[in-house]
C-alpha cells in the first residue's frame, strides 16, 4: 500500500508527521518539486509547537516552507486555510516589496533568522523543509 | 543483486503506441524513485520522466509531455513507460533508472541494459 | 533548463595515464553532479555521486571534486578496462540533464 507508518532514512519524526531538513538550497519551485517527489509536502506550520520545532532544526538560515501568494491570496500547498490558521510573520510582512530589483514583487513565504516568516522572491536558492504525515490508521492503538 | 530489466521495445509507425516495462529486483522497489533516460547518437542521454515511491507524482521533459505517462506498480516491482503519438524523434535506446538516496537530488544509481524503440513508417 | 558542458569529446591515453574530464554547469548545482561509465552494450555505472563521493565497489583510481558550476573527474592511472564512455549528469533540478560525454581510447 501506499501508507507511510514510519519515516524514511534521513527524515525526523514529530508528532506524527515526518519531516526533511535540505542542507543546500533551491528557488521556492524546485523545492516545491523536490518534496513532490518524495511524496510530500514543503513544510506546512499549522501550531506554535510545530513552529518552535522546525525552527530548532534550521537554525537561523533563511528557509522556505510551503507557503505563497504567486496566484493571489496567499495559501499553504496542502490546502490548510490560510486566513484562520497558524501565523508568525514578522512586523510589516508579508510586504510584497518590490525594490530588490529582480522583477515582480515577493510571493512566497520562507522562515527568517530569527524563525519568523518573511515573503521574498521565489527564485532565491533557500533551504527548504519538506513534511509528510503518517498514514492516520497507525495512529490507533490496537486493539486488545 | 540489484537488477533493472526493461522491455517492450521495437519498431511501430509515426503515430503509434508502445508501451515499455521495467521489471526490478533484488531492491525494496517501493522505497525508491524511478527514472525513465532515452539514449540516441546524435542527441546523447535525455531524461524523460520522474516518478515519486507510491507513484503520486511525476514530472516529464518538456519533449514528451502529454504524450508520454510514467506509472509503477509496486505490487509486480514494475516501471511502465505509456508512449503515445510516437514520433520519429523518439528512436532511441530506453533505460530505466532508479533514483539514488542523494541528499536532495535526484540522481541516478542504478540503471537497466535498455530496450530499443526504432519509430519508422 | 541546465546546460552541462562536458570536455574533452575524446582522448586518447596510455595505460598508467592520469586522464581529467571537465564538466560545467550553466548554473549553479551545488554538488548534485553523477560521473557514470558506459561500456559498448552494457548498462551505463555510477562511478561518482554528490560530485566528490566515490560508489562503493568503484575502484580508487577513479576520482571527483568541485562545486556550483565546475567540476573534474580524474583518473589517476588509466587501466586497459577503462576503455568507455564517461558522462556527468546533473541532478539539482527536474529536468535532469547530461553532458555530451567523453569517450576514452587506450593509444
Known amino acids: 500500500g501506499s501508507e507511510r507508518t514510519c519515516c524514511p532514512v534521513n527524515w525526523v519524526e514529530h508528532e506524527r508527521s515526518c519531516y526533511w531538513f535540505s542542507r543546500s538550497g533551491k528557488a521556492w519551485a524546485d523545492a516545491d518539486n523536490y518534496c513532490r517527489l518524495e511524496d510530500a509536502h514543503l513544510v506546512v506550520v499549522t501550531s506554535w509547537e510545530e513552529q518552535k520545532f522546525v525552527q530548532r532544526h534550521i537554525g537561523p538560515v533563511n528557509t522556505w516552507m510551503g507557503l505563497h501568494d504567486q496566484n493571489g491570496p496567499w495559501k499553504w500547498v496542502d490546502g490548510t486555510d490560510y486566513e484562520t490558521g497558524f501565523k508568525n510573520w514578522r512586523p510589516e510582512q508579508p510586504d510584497d516589496w518590490y525594490g530588490h530589483g529582480l522583477g515582480g514583487g515577493e510571493d512566497c513565504a520562507h522562515f527568517t533568522d530569527d524563525g519568523r516568516w518573511n515573503d521574498d522572491v521565489c527564485q532565491r536558492p533557500y533551504r527548504w523543509v519538506c513534511e509528510t504525515e503518517l498514514d492516520k490508521a497507525s495512529q490507533e492503538p490496537p486493539l486488545l | 543483486q540489484v537488477q533493472l530489466v526493461e522491455s517492450g521495445g521495437g519498431v511501430v509507425q509515426p503515430g503509434r503506441s508502445l508501451r515499455l516495462s521495467c521489471a526490478a529486483s533484488?531492491?525494496?522497489?517501493?522505497?525508491?524513485?524511478m527514472h525513465w533516460v532515452r539514449q540516441t547518437p546524435g542527441k546523447g542521454l535525455e531524461w524523460v520522466a520522474i516518478?515519486?515511491?507510491?507513484?503520486?507524482?511525476?514530472y516529464y521533459a518538456d519533449s514528451v509531455k502529454g504524450r508520454f505517462t510514467i506509472s509503477r506498480d509496486n505490487s509486480k516491482n514494475t516501471l511502465y513507460l505509456q508512449m503515445n503519438s510516437l514520433r520519429a524523434e523518439d528512436t532511441a535506446v530506453y533505460y530505466c533508472?532508479?533514483?539514488?538516496?542523494?541528499?536532495?537530488?535526484?540522481?541516478?544509481?542504478?540503471w537497466g541494459q535498455g530496450t530499443t524503440v526504432t519509430v519508422s513508417s | 533548463d541546465i546546460q552541462m558542458t562536458q570536455s574533452p569529446s575524446s582522448r586518447s591515453a596510455s595505460v598508467g595515464d592520469r586522464v581529467t574530464i571537465t564538466c560545467q554547469a550553466s548554473?549553479?548545482?551545488?554538488?548534485?553532479l553523477n560521473w557514470c561509465q558506459q561500456k559498448p552494450g552494457k548498462a551505463l555505472k555510477l562511478l561518482i555521486y554528490?560530485?566528490?563521493t566515490l560508489e562503493t565497489g568503484v575502484p580508487s583510481r577513479f576520482s571527483g571534486s568541485g562545486s556550483g558550476t565546475d567540476f573534474t573527474f580524474t583518473i589517476s592511472s588509466v587501466q586497459p578496462e577503462d576503455i568507455a564512455t564517461y558522462y556527468c549528469?546533473?541532478?539539482?533540478?527536474?529536468?535532469?540533464?547530461f553532458g555530451q560525454g567523453t569517450r576514452l581510447e587506450i593509444k
Open positions: 533484488g531492491f525494496t522497489f517501493s522505497s525508491y524513485g
Open positions: 549528469q546533473q541532478y539539482d533540478n527536474v529536468p535532469i540533464t
Open positions: 548554473q549553479d548545482i551545488s554538488n548534485y
Open positions: 516518478i515519486s515511491y507510491v507513484g503520486k507524482n511525476k
Open positions: 533508472a532508479r533514483r539514488g538516496n542523494s541528499y536532495g537530488g535526484y540522481g541516478m544509481d542504478v
Open positions: 554528490d560530485a566528490s
